[in-house]
């Protein structure tokens, strides 16, 4: 008789979960020479340690404190890139600029990119059928709280001028209950950051609006003020140009308007 | 090329008010924070804090506050450090740095002497 | 209050010879592999000039000859070598945390 499982609102862990972690692993330390020292073997181990046998509702930070510390990366504190809804064109932007970092460019946020995963209370066991969904059924759930401290420590660790990519076409550019809103904003260091420079993507070929004076802007603006923190703003009004004049910044057509 | 241009010595008495001015050129003001910092003749740097250019917000060291106030004329790229109430003690150089500390003033010298 | 305790206090080398000077935290001024702690040389009626920032990282303009170590609470400023125009003082500062603070300075000179 097949004993009585959980359901949850979300969808299951990712199939072929531990392979693709512990294969993400070998990948980014083979082609970062500086995290060659990292055991892809105690990265999964303790990976696996921050949820197995636990319930997915009662996730800690502290559950996954052996992996962050095995994950410890330096990563060069004034070329970090933020983003908020545009993850792609966030990506695709530090494919293009090296020097430049987001959150999924570090080890540990490679290792989780677009993978979902819990398991079950007192069982080794783990949970491919579902798992808690944030809003329906807790937020406190692996993958969320993953996404929340390894969030935290990449805003924490920023310095100088920080970027962050927002999403023009979405109707709250800055969502104050975002990843960015909620953590990442918070947890910039006033000492360390002496300014948040804000661009945002317009998604229409015509749209020549000043998104930059967007109410939710001013709310962006309001808060990073609050903390400190200096504040500025750029509208991309040309996605695909702005990415071209990236590659070819000598491009003469890059001397205008983006 | 970047540059902060800071007013020229001050000699003072002892109760008067002093007003030093940092003129930045070469960037936006608004766009990096200053710091102020002490030298007293033949010692060390001693930090006294910084204005947000962008919302005017300053933030004194410990040993700064109350007699010591930073403000801005975002018009004319200008920072200020006003010295109220001025004792002795205060002789010094004081210097304006952009944020960051790569690119300091030339320095103001401020003698307060009876 | 981070203190920053510099030795020595003075220092003299012969030309072309390397010079070390240290500066001890009382608390760590490292967050995440990066260390906030910058290096400053002074020449007398001159401000200060930014040598090394982040510990390590040799700011535009400065000669390689200069270099920056060390990580949490300790760290070193390297001259190597020494010519006659390093003459001046140098300074640690921290800006990990406010207060950021200065060391009490180390006057080179040549032997």
């Known amino acids: 008789v097949p004993r009585w499982r959980q359901q949850w609102s979300g969808p299951g862990t990712t199939k072929r979960f531990p392979e693709t972690v512990l294969a993400r692993c070998v990948k980014y330390t083979e082609i970062h020479p500086e995290m060659r020292h990292v055991d892809c073997q105690s990265v999964w181990d303790a990976f696996k340690g921050a949820f197995i046998s636990k319930h997915p509702c009662n996730i800690t930070e502290e559950d996954y404190q052996p992996l962050m510390k095995l994950g410890t990366q330096t990563v060069p504190c004034n070329k970090i890139l933020l983003w908020s809804r545009i993850k792609d064109l966030a990506h695709q932007f530090t494919q293009v600029q090296r020097d430049m970092f987001t959150l999924e460019d570090t080890l540990l946020g490679y290792l989780a990119d677009d993978l979902t995963w819990c398991g079950e209370f007192n069982t080794s066991k783990i949970n491919y059928q579902s798992c808690p969904d944030w809003r329906k059924d807790c937020s406190n759930n692996p993958v969320s709280v993953f996404w929340k401290t390894v969030s935290r420590r990449f805003a924490e660790a920023a310095c100088d001028v920080v970027h962050v990519m927002l999403n023009g076409s979405r109707s709250k550019i800055f969502d104050k209950n975002s990843t960015f809103g909620s953590v990442e904003v918070h947890n910039l260091q006033p000492e360390k950051v002496q300014t948040l420079e804000a661009w945002v993507i317009h998604g229409g070929r015509e749209d020549s609006r000043d998104l930059c004076q967007d109410p939710t802007i001013k709310e962006l603006e309001s808060i990073i003020s609050k903390r400190n923190i200096q504040f500025s703003c750029k509208n991309i009004y040309r996605p695909d140009k702005f990415l071209q004049c990236v590659k070819n910044p000598e491009d003469s057509s890059c001397t205008s308007e983006i | 090329q970047i540059q902060l241009v800071q007013s020229g010595p001050e000699l003072k008495k002892p109760g008067e008010t002093v007003k030093i001015s940092c003129k930045a050129s070469?960037?936006?003001?608004?766009?990096?924070?200053m710091n102020w910092v002490k030298q007293a003749p033949g010692k060390g740097l001693k930090w006294m804090g910084w204005?947000?250019?962008?919302?005017?917000?300053?933030t004194y060291a410990d040993d700064f506050k109350g007699r010591f106030a930073f403000s801005l004329e975002t018009s004319a790229s200008t920072a200020f450090l006003q010295i109220n109430n001025l004792k002795n003690e205060d002789t010094a150089t004081y210097f304006c740095v952009r944020r960051g500390f790569a690119y300091w003033g030339q320095g103001t010298l401020v003698t307060v002497s009876a | 209050n981070i203190v920053l305790t510099q030795s020595p206090a003075s220092l003299a080398v012969s030309l072309g010879q390397r010079a070390t000077i240290s500066c001890r935290a009382s608390?760590?001024?490292?967050?995440?592999?990066?260390?906030?702690m910058n290096w400053f040389q002074q020449k007398p009626g001159q401000p200060p000039k930014l040598l090394i920032y982040?510990?390590?990282n040799l700011e535009s303009g400065i000669p390689a000859r200069f270099s920056g170590s060390g990580s949490r609470t300790e760290f070193t400023l390297t001259i190597d070598p020494v010519e006659a125009d390093d003459v001046a003082t140098y300074y640690c500062?921290?800006?990990?945390?406010?207060?950021?603070?200065f060391g009490s300075g180390t006057k080179l000179e040549i032997k």
């Open positions: 204005i947000n250019t962008y919302t005017g917000e300053p």
């Open positions: 608390e760590s001024v490292e967050i995440y592999g990066n260390g906030f």
């Open positions: 982040r510990a390590s």
């Open positions: 070469g960037y936006t003001l608004t766009s990096y924070g």
């Open positions: 500062q921290q800006i990990n945390e406010d207060p950021f603070t």
